[in-house]
């Protein structure tokens, strides 16, 4: 039994496919050395409330992506959203759950911003 999810393929998308001379969409197989982990990723922008996917595909061995079964961006309001995950096609869906900075508790609890899903 595998101790972790092995990423063998990811959803591929490139909004700039013509300029970058790539396919626009498809499935990307993630090959690699036996001692390296592979991940899936998604990057997107939030343009006035509308989600615009920038890129999706395989991502190189990155400790920040280890053991993440879901693709979730946790940074608060980045200009470009990014998430990575492990497991086949785990970047098909992605979401945004900003981590609230720990400050002195207030009487009014902070409601997390709603996630975005593809």
């Amino acid at each position: 039994i595998l101790g972790r999810s092995e990423t063998q393929e990811c959803l591929f998308f490139n909004a700039n496919w013509e300029k970058d001379r790539t396919n626009q969409t498809g499935v990307e197989p993630c090959y690699g050395d036996k001692d390296k982990r592979r991940h899936c990723f998604a990057t997107w922008k939030n343009i006035s409330g509308s989600i615009e996917i920038v890129k999706q595909g395989c991502w190189l061995d990155d400790i920040n992506c280890y053991d993440r079964t879901d693709c979730v961006e946790k940074k608060d309001s980045p200009e470009v959203y990014f998430c990575c995950c492990e497991g086949n096609m785990c970047n098909e869906k992605f979401s945004y759950f900003p981590e609230m900075e720990v400050t002195q508790p207030t009487s009014n609890p902070v409601t997390p911003k709603p996630p975005y899903y593809n």
Epitope: N16, K19, G32, G57, E79
Partner: antibody, heavy 120, light 107 residues
Framework: QVQLVQSGAEVKKPGASVKVSCKAS????????MHWVRQAPGQGLEWMGW????????NYAQKFQGRVTMTRDTSISTAYMELSRLRSDDTAVYYC?????????????WGQGTTVTVSS | DIQMTQSPSSVSASVGDRVTITCRAS??????LAWYQQKPGKAPKLLIY???SLQSGVPSRFSGSGSGTDFTLTISSLQPEDFATYYC?????????FGGGTKVEIK
């Protein structure tokens, strides 16, 4: 081991062309894009463009459009960069660099560099 | 085009010092950032990719951090072989662009 070996130094006159080669070994040549980067004396690194050896597709920096041609010969695992209408400010060390197969595509293996001198 | 601005352009330090180099992108590039080391007369060498991932074979005294527009390369304890020029580079959108470089010199 993975290696990129470039052709030797060149001296050219203004207006001429130069063609630099980059021979790959130790990996599947068609599995990685090949980029070209140059460095003028005492200056920083300047990205010129890339070729996908599998498809032959290229992507050039605007600055070099119309003057640069990147090609490859998959039978001998070699990439080429030709720069035409040379000027004195093209004097530089030219590097080929393999990029990783996947995002975020770092340049993980570099050639040793080819010095091109443009002088009348 | 995305501009990459490195600072400082040069830094004088001693063996054992902690050295920090910063790189700022003119627009968000998420984590599409790499750091390279170049010694005189040699080709650049990849140190860090994806803003913070250490390339195989690179000593752990090198570390990278940041995302979006602001990035940092840190050498925790400078060694004699670390005196070199360091470049950041973005691969988020074409054309790929490099920072102007930071020369780490012996004090």
């Amino acid at each position: 081991q993975v290696q990129l070996v470039q052709s030797g130094a060149e001296v050219k006159k203004p207006g001429a062309s130069v063609k630099v080669s980059c021979k790959a070994s130790g990996y599947t040549f068609t599995g990685h894009k090949m980029h070209w980067v140059r460095q003028a004396p005492g200056q920083g690194l300047e990205w010129m463009g890339w070729i996908n050896p599998a498809s032959g597709w290229t992507n050039y920096a605007q600055k070099f459009q119309g003057r640069v041609t990147m090609t490859r010969d998959t039978s001998i695992s070699t990439a080429y960069m030709e720069l035409s209408r040379l000027r004195s400010d093209d004097t530089a060390v030219y590097y080929c660099a393999r990029v990783s197969m996947y995002a975020p595509e770092p340049m993980d293996v570099w050639g040793q560099g080819t010095t091109v001198t443009v002088s009348s | 085009d995305i501009q990459m601005t490195q600072s400082p352009s040069s830094v004088s330090a001693s063996v054992g010092d902690r050295v920090t180099i910063t790189c700022r992108a003119s627009q968000g590039i998420s984590r599409w950032l790499a750091w390279y080391q170049q010694k005189p007369g040699k080709a650049p060498k990849l140190l860090i990719y994806a803003a913070s991932s250490l390339q195989s074979g690179v000593p752990s005294r090198f570390s990278g951090s940041g995302s979006g527009t602001d990035f940092t390369l840190t050498i925790s304890s400078l060694q004699p072989e670390d005196f070199a020029t360091y470049y950041c580079q973005q691969a988020f959108s074409h054309p790929w662009t490099f920072g102007g470089g930071t020369k780490v010199e012996i004090k």
